[in-house]
């Protein structure tokens, strides 16, 4: 059984205020069973950016159809970027658990920074 790897290919992503940013994340295995969530930052202060299972995240769309059984692409797009969106974004795999899912593995992170001034 292949060990799960979380791949975030870009270390740095330069974005423009007002535009859409695409944050890439792919996994190398479908196991263990459980969701992939996106966070900005690490530790207890991290911000939840996207959770497929619950919540409403109006500025976030997924690149792939996460409902497909064999999907391994958990990349997201964040629209209408502002200066307050800068930071390092992590895709994090959770293992299905009861009563709560358990964090299993995190990607290495992609730092989002402003690459152009707003017009």
């Amino acid at each position: 059984e292949e060990e799960l790897q979380m791949i975030q290919p870009e270390k740095l992503l330069l974005v423009t205020v007002g535009k859409t940013a695409t944050l890439h994340c792919t996994v190398t295995s479908l196991l263990p069973v459980g969701p992939v969530l996106w966070f900005r930052g690490v530790g207890p202060g991290r911000e939840l950016i996207y959770n497929q299972k619950e919540g409403h995240f109006p500025r976030v769309t997924t690149v792939s159809d996460l409902t497909k059984r064999n999907n391994m692409d958990f990349s997201i797009r964040i629209s209408s970027i502002t200066p307050a969106d800068v930071g390092t974004y992590y895709c994090v795999k959770f293992r299905k658990g009861s009563p709560e899912n358990v964090e299993f593995k995190s990607g290495p992170g992609t730092e989002m920074a402003l690459g152009a001034k707003p017009s």
Epitope: G18, H56, T82, P118
Partner: antibody, heavy 118, light 108 residues
Framework: VQLVESGGGVVRPGESLRLSCAAS????????MNWVRQAPGEGLEWVSR????????DYAESVKGRFTISRDNSENTLYLQMNSLRAEDTAVYYC????????????WGLGALVTVSS | ETVLTQSPATLSVSPGERATLSCRAS??????LAWHQQKPGQAPRLLIY???NRATGIPDRFSGSGSGTDFTLTISSLQTEDSAVYYC??????????FGGGTKVEIK
């Protein structure tokens, strides 16, 4: 979406008070939450914010070191612990849900009146 | 720190007429501006977000425009129930979140 504040009242300067905000009708643990206050006859002043998981907090300079925001995601409840209260803290305190992690306030509670008077 | 200045402080308009409220930011806030309505003795209510988008359940007589530093809230045909204080809020730079000082709309 419903947000209901409680815990307001009359206290003397230097005393403490804890406000609660019971949330329902949405996935509470997925959203950042805020406290906003309004002094009598005045405008709106943002007080504090807490991120969805509860580990990240921000405060207005006017309350930093005296107020503590917290949340219990298992109970769908937001709190504001207010210590060393001053007369200028007298206000209606509203809890407000944030639209996303970096957004405006899309739902407001009805407010809790805090009066600090000797 | 971004400062929001609302004008006029008070606006007196006859029923059925147009009301135009202004909010000016001290630096660009892109389109990240919301408008909230607060009726006497009530909590604020979201009207407009991202400068131009009406919130759920808001009548279409309310519209928002502008970007950068200058924003306008327009009530196309004022109703008696629109008597309230209107606040703008920016969420481009934070913390802190900032509100304007408010515009009180009175019915003539």
């Amino acid at each position: 979406v419903q947000l209901v504040e409680s815990g307001g009242g009359v206290v003397r300067p230097g005393e403490s008070l804890r406000l609660s905000c019971a949330a329902s009708g949405f996935s509470f643990s997925s959203y950042a939450m805020n406290w906003v206050r309004q002094a009598p006859g005045e405008g709106l002043e943002w007080v504090s914010r807490i991120n969805s998981g509860g580990g990240g907090t921000d405060y207005a300079e006017s309350v930093k070191g005296r107020f503590t925001i917290s949340r219990d995601n298992s109970e769908n409840t937001l709190y504001l612990q207010m210590n060393s209260l001053r007369a200028e803290d007298t206000a209606v305190y509203y809890c407000a849900k944030q639209y996303d992690w970096n957004g405006f306030f899309d739902y407001w509670g009805l407010g809790a009146l805090v009066t600090v008077s000797s | 720190e971004t400062v929001l200045t609302q004008s006029p402080a008070t606006l007196s308009v006859s029923p059925g007429e147009r009301a135009t409220l202004s909010c000016r930011a001290s630096q660009t806030v892109g389109s990240k501006l919301a408008w909230h309505q607060q009726k006497p003795g009530q909590a604020p209510r979201l009207l407009i977000y991202d400068a131009t988008n009406r919130a759920t359940g808001i009548p279409d007589r309310f519209s928002g425009s502008g970007s950068g530093t200058d924003f306008t809230l327009t009530i196309s045909s004022l109703q008696t129930e629109d008597s309230a204080v209107y606040y703008c809020q920016q969420y481009y730079y934070w913390p802190p979140y900032r509100f304007g000082g408010g515009t009180k709309v009175e019915i003539k």
